[in-house]
């Protein structure tokens, strides 16, 4: 499978909420022995490999934000820690995987990465990630609502092993 990022850039006004989204593409094994680990983290541009650096989102690490579920399940973070920081990650039955960030500030601007690991325990693992940029703006030039910019088909399916 691959991870697509439907939007490569999100431009949002300060104080707005935004949902960053990744989507699983291609054949996804939903057998009983397969589980999925999904998480989000911040990274930075200019690296040899995008998303290789893992930095916290609002002081929450990728461990704090992770979802781990069977291939046939949906999941979302319900723990108070994430919600206290205005964050919630979720995964549905259709391969969509998202993080919602509430009450955006300028400090939230940066590169965000989703990581998906397909695990056949003791047999194999397959890691893929996607990246997208969030720009939080303030002042007269800021949009009234979030504006999203679609990825090119090349970008949205350009996957590097994590």
């Amino acid at each position: 499978f691959k991870v697509a990022t439907p939007y490569s850039l999100y431009v949002c006004p300060e104080g707005q909420n935004v949902t960053l989204t990744c989507r699983l593409l291609g054949p996804v094994d939903k057998g009983h022995d397969v589980t999925f680990y999904k998480t989000w983290y911040r990274s930075s541009r200019g690296e040899v490999q995008t998303c290789s650096e893992r930095r916290p989102i609002r002081n929450l690490t990728f461990q704090d934000l992770h979802l781990h579920h069977g291939g046939h399940q949906a999941a979302n973070t319900s723990h108070d820690l994430a919600q206290r920081h205005g964050l919630e990650s979720a995964s549905d039955h259709h391969g969509n995987f998202s993080i919602t960030m509430r009450n955006l500030t300028l400090l939230d601007s940066g590169l965000y990465c989703c990581l998906v690991v397909e695990i056949r325990h003791h047999h194999s693992e397959h890691r893929v990630h996607g990246a997208m940029e969030l720009q939080v703006q303030t002042g007269k030039d800021a949009p009234s609502n979030c504006v999203v910019y679609p990825s090119s088909s090349q970008d949205s399916e350009n996957i590097t092993a994590a």
Partner: antibody, heavy 116, light 111 residues
Framework: EVQLVESGGGLVQPGGSLRLSCAAS????????MGWVRQAPGKGLEWVGI???????YYASWAKGRFTISRDNSKNTLYLQMNSLRAEDTAVYYC??????????WGQGTLVTVSS | EIVMTQSPATLSLSPGERATLSCQAS???????LAWYQQKPGQAPRLLIY???TLASGIPARFSGSGSGTDFTLTISSLQPEDFAVYYC????????????FGGGTKVEIK
């Protein structure tokens, strides 16, 4: 009979090397994940590393660079190559088979003593 | 670094009593990847429970496991003489890399 038998342990000087073997019988090694776990005298269990079915190998952070796991499917044998040994590596080393979500089958262990 | 912490380190009980052993992980463990082992002196560990609560083959029903997330429990409902041993929990983590972490063990001894 399905079993694992470790060998190759013994006394080695600090800085020396040793290769442990784990002979599997009653099943095909290549069809299972195989791990190494050690236990220092009077202490608890400590994971060393694992080779999963796909061939990917993972190590405990302290073992990276000094210890190497490999397998020879034709001999149905798992190996642990240990280099630059230290006194704190003194332990009983167990090989264990990954069954489903856990280690369901263990060998009897082989003692490695690192001392001058 | 991932740490599995077991408590208490030693549990002194009499045969027939109930034993409750705790295991806490420093990060969330997917419950399918949590196991308990029993070890007696001079012997290799023996699998008791896998997937947090599933009894391994041949293990008596007096053993049970529960828990999720970071907190797991092994319960022995009525201790038998052969149950006095050291018990270890073990969790598997895949992020950032594959790690199998063992707890420090709980020794269940005769009071």
């Amino acid at each position: 009979e399905v079993q694992l038998v470790e060998s190759g342990g013994g006394l080695v000087q600090p800085g020396g090397s040793l290769r442990l073997s784990c002979a599997a019988s009653g099943f095909s090694l290549s069809s299972y994940a195989m791990g190494w776990v050690r236990q220092a005298p009077g202490k608890g269990l400590e994971w060393v590393g694992i080779i999963i079915v796909s061939g990917n190998i993972y190590y405990a952070s302290w073992a990276k660079g000094r210890f190497t796991i490999s397998r020879d499917n034709s001999k149905n044998t798992l190996y642990l190559q240990m280099n630059s040994l230290r006194a704190e590596d003194t332990a009983v080393y167990y090989c264990a088979r990954g069954d489903g979500y856990t280690y369901g089958l263990w060998g009897q262990g082989t003692l490695v003593t690192v001392s001058s | 670094e991932i740490v599995m912490t077991q408590s208490p380190a030693t549990l002194s009980l009499s045969p027939g009593e109930r034993a409750t052993l705790s295991c806490q992980a420093s990060q969330s463990v997917y419950s399918r990847y949590l196991a308990w082992y029993q070890q007696k002196p001079g012997q290799a560990p023996r699998l008791l429970i896998y997937s947090a609560s599933t009894l391994a083959s041949g293990i008596p029903a007096r053993f049970s496991g529960s828990g999720s997330g970071t907190d797991f429990t092994l319960t022995i409902s009525s201790l038998q003489p052969e149950d006095f041993a050291v018990y270890y929990c073990q969790g598997t983590f895949y992020i950032p890399d594959y790690i199998d972490g063992f707890g420090g063990g709980t020794k269940v001894e005769i009071k």
